[in-house]
Interface confidence: low
């Protein structure tokens, strides 16, 4: 566990005031594990939100302001915010402790290079390609077929993002069913709209949150005939490769630790996104965002 490098009594270091969720996401996306900020809740005035970079994502934890002037996060209550931060210096949130506050002016994500000129809004959009059929199992879902290109609107949850399809329909999509796309030639936004100007798959840190329903650029060469539903474990185990390291909390005996590249035998796909599996004789639960399923029809893609 990395040691914390901040003074919890220095409110100016970690309290960012009325920063939006999207702004917090932008500041923390791709930053070091354990970087955090505290902001005002935009949906519940008077409450706060602890936004944390953990496990290659940004998590947002609500901090309720109680009538007795105490602060509550999950089931824990504290007399003041510095006490809450002190607690999470040494206790895990989900996968990290609090290590350092985010800089007041966001620095570029780790491993990225600052662009000399900012991209236009359209270049800022984040696109994904769908890997499997998803019929949708909730009214809020966005159903899709394998091979569609969707634009990401918002990332409200680790495993479920809000996306828009080419018809302008918006809904929630399961992250493990898609892969991110980045433009292979980002120069000039008015390129051939029918050409496939997307590269495969590299994390895109910035994302826009447009409220319009402009259609997506069409992409030629999308596989239309081969429709692949997510494999089912009913016909035996499904194999997947770990694409993200996972170090579970030491107290969680049901969790399965993963190293990037581990081959996971998936034995059960629970609908809540916590899958059951086995690695080298170790069994346990893991979030389905941490693995990529081997596609039996495309063995070359599994490399």
């Amino acid at each position: 566990m990395s040691s914390a490098r901040f003074d919890s009594s220095d409110r100016s270091a970690w309290y960012m005031g009325p920063v939006s969720r999207q702004e917090a996401q932008t500041r923390l996306q791709g930053q070091r594990h354990g970087m955090f900020l505290v902001r005002d809740s935009s949906t519940c005035p008077g409450d706060y939100v602890l936004s944390v970079s953990e496990n290659s994502r940004v998590s947002h934890y609500i901090i309720n302001s109680l009538p007795n002037r105490r602060f509550k996060i999950g089931d824990q209550e504290f007399d003041h915010l510095p006490a809450l931060l002190e607690f999470y210096k040494i206790h895990y949130l989900d996968t990290t402790t609090l290590i350092e506050p985010a800089p007041r002016y966001p620095s570029p994500p780790m491993g990225s290079v600052s662009a000399p000129n900012l991209p236009t809004a359209e270049d800022n959009l984040e696109y994904v390609r769908t890997l499997y059929d998803f019929p949708g199992n909730d009214a809020e879902d966005l159903p899709f077929k394998k091979g569609e290109i969707l634009v990401i609107i918002e990332k409200p949850e680790e495993q479920w993002w809000s996306a828009r399809n080419k018809d302008g329909r918006v809904g929630m999509i399961p992250v493990p069913y898609v892969e991110k796309l980045v433009r292979s030639s980002p120069h000039g936004k008015h390129g051939n709209r029918n050409s496939n100007s997307y590269g495969i798959p590299e994390p895109a840190h910035a994302y826009a949150q447009p409220q319009t329903t402009t259609p997506l650029p069409a992409v030629s060469g999308s596989p239309g005939a081969a429709i692949t539903p997510l494999p089912s474990t009913q016909n035996g185990p499904v194999f997947a490769k770990a694409i993200q390291k996972r170090v579970p909390c030491a107290y969680d005996k049901t969790a399965l630790a993963l190293e990037v590249g581990d081959i996971v035998k998936v034995t059960r796909m629970n609908i809540n996104g916590q899958w059951e599996g086995e690695v080298n004789g170790r069994k346990g639960l893991f979030p389905f965002t941490h693995v990529k399923i081997f596609d039996p029809q495309n063995p070359d893609e599994n490399e």
């Epitope: 999950g74 409200p156 809904g171 609908i271 809540n272």
Partner: antibody, heavy 126, light 112 residues
Framework: QVQLVQSGAEVKKPGASVKLSCKPS????????IHWLRQAPGQGLEWMGI????????SSAQKFQGRVTMTRDTSTSTIYMELSSLRAEDTAVYYC???????????????????WGQGTLVTVSS | QSVLTQPPSVSGAPGQRVTISCTGS?????????VHWYKVIPGTAPKLLIY???NRPSGVPDRFSGSKSGTSASLAITGLQSEDEADYYC????????????FGGGTKLTVL
């Protein structure tokens, strides 16, 4: 604070239509889906449909398809639900509800309805 | 006919403990969907009581607790008070239904 304020009670004749309104406040209008539910006298809660205030996309339960129309007016941040071809069994209290983040450390797969309107009683009688 | 099954009524004296069950199937609660509980007093807006099987929103007393096992869930209320008299509904989702939001038939709690 978050509130969903619904329009007042309605009395309608069979075959008519009713249009109910729901005005959310205290949060960004476009950020949360709004669902419509109803409760008939002596019956349980029943889900009717959903509207995404951002794009206007709607979806309704099979039982109500063809009879229910959900719309939104972004200029007034108001959601509407119209039910046509009313019958006596449509007599119920109609609720709008926000399905949103309760936001704690627990990751909930499908969010609950965290805020509800006060309900609108619709009476269908000849 | 509701997708989730609840007892129509339960009762208890002040200070007692009561539980309300909610039974589903492999396509809803058993499919790992979360269960949420609501308190409904006629004429007022329903109130979220328990979400994600066993979590209380802020402001809900710790006398209320939820649990889930297999294809069923339950709501427990300890130290029963007169203001607890209301209808209680469980809610989940069903993978076999397009609308997916499903409720129990509701349980009327009477405080004797």
């Amino acid at each position: 604070q978050v509130q969903l304020v619904q329009s007042g009670a309605e009395v309608k004749k069979p075959g008519a239509s009713v249009k109910l309104s729901c005005k959310p406040s205290g949060y960004t209008f476009s950020s949360y889906y709004i669902h419509w539910l109803r409760q008939a006298p002596g019956q349980g809660l029943e889900w009717m449909g959903i509207i995404n205030p951002s794009g206007g996309y709607t979806s309704s339960a099979q039982k109500f398809q063809g009879r229910v129309t959900m719309t939104r007016d972004t200029s007034t941040s108001t959601i509407y639900m119209e039910l046509s071809s009313l019958r006596a069994e449509d007599t119920a209290v109609y609720y709008c509800a926000r399905r949103g983040e309760v936001g704690t450390m627990v990751r909930v797969f499908r969010k609950p309805f965290d805020y509800w309107g006060q309900g609108t009683l619709v009476t269908v009688s000849s | 006919q509701s997708v989730l099954t609840q007892p129509p009524s339960v009762s208890g004296a002040p200070g007692q403990r009561v539980t309300i069950s909610c039974t589903g199937s492999s396509s809803n609660i058993g499919a790992q969907y979360d269960v949420h509980w609501y308190k409904v007093i006629p004429g007022t807006a329903p109130k979220l009581l328990i979400y994600g099987n066993d979590n209380r929103p802020s402001g809900v007393p710790d006398r209320f607790s939820g649990s889930k096992s297999g294809t069923s869930a339950s709501l427990a209320i300890t130290g029963l008070q007169s203001e607890d008299e209301a209808d209680y509904y469980c809610q989940s989702n069903d993978i076999s239904l397009s609308g997916s939001v499903v409720f129990g038939g509701g349980t009327k709690l009477t405080v004797l």
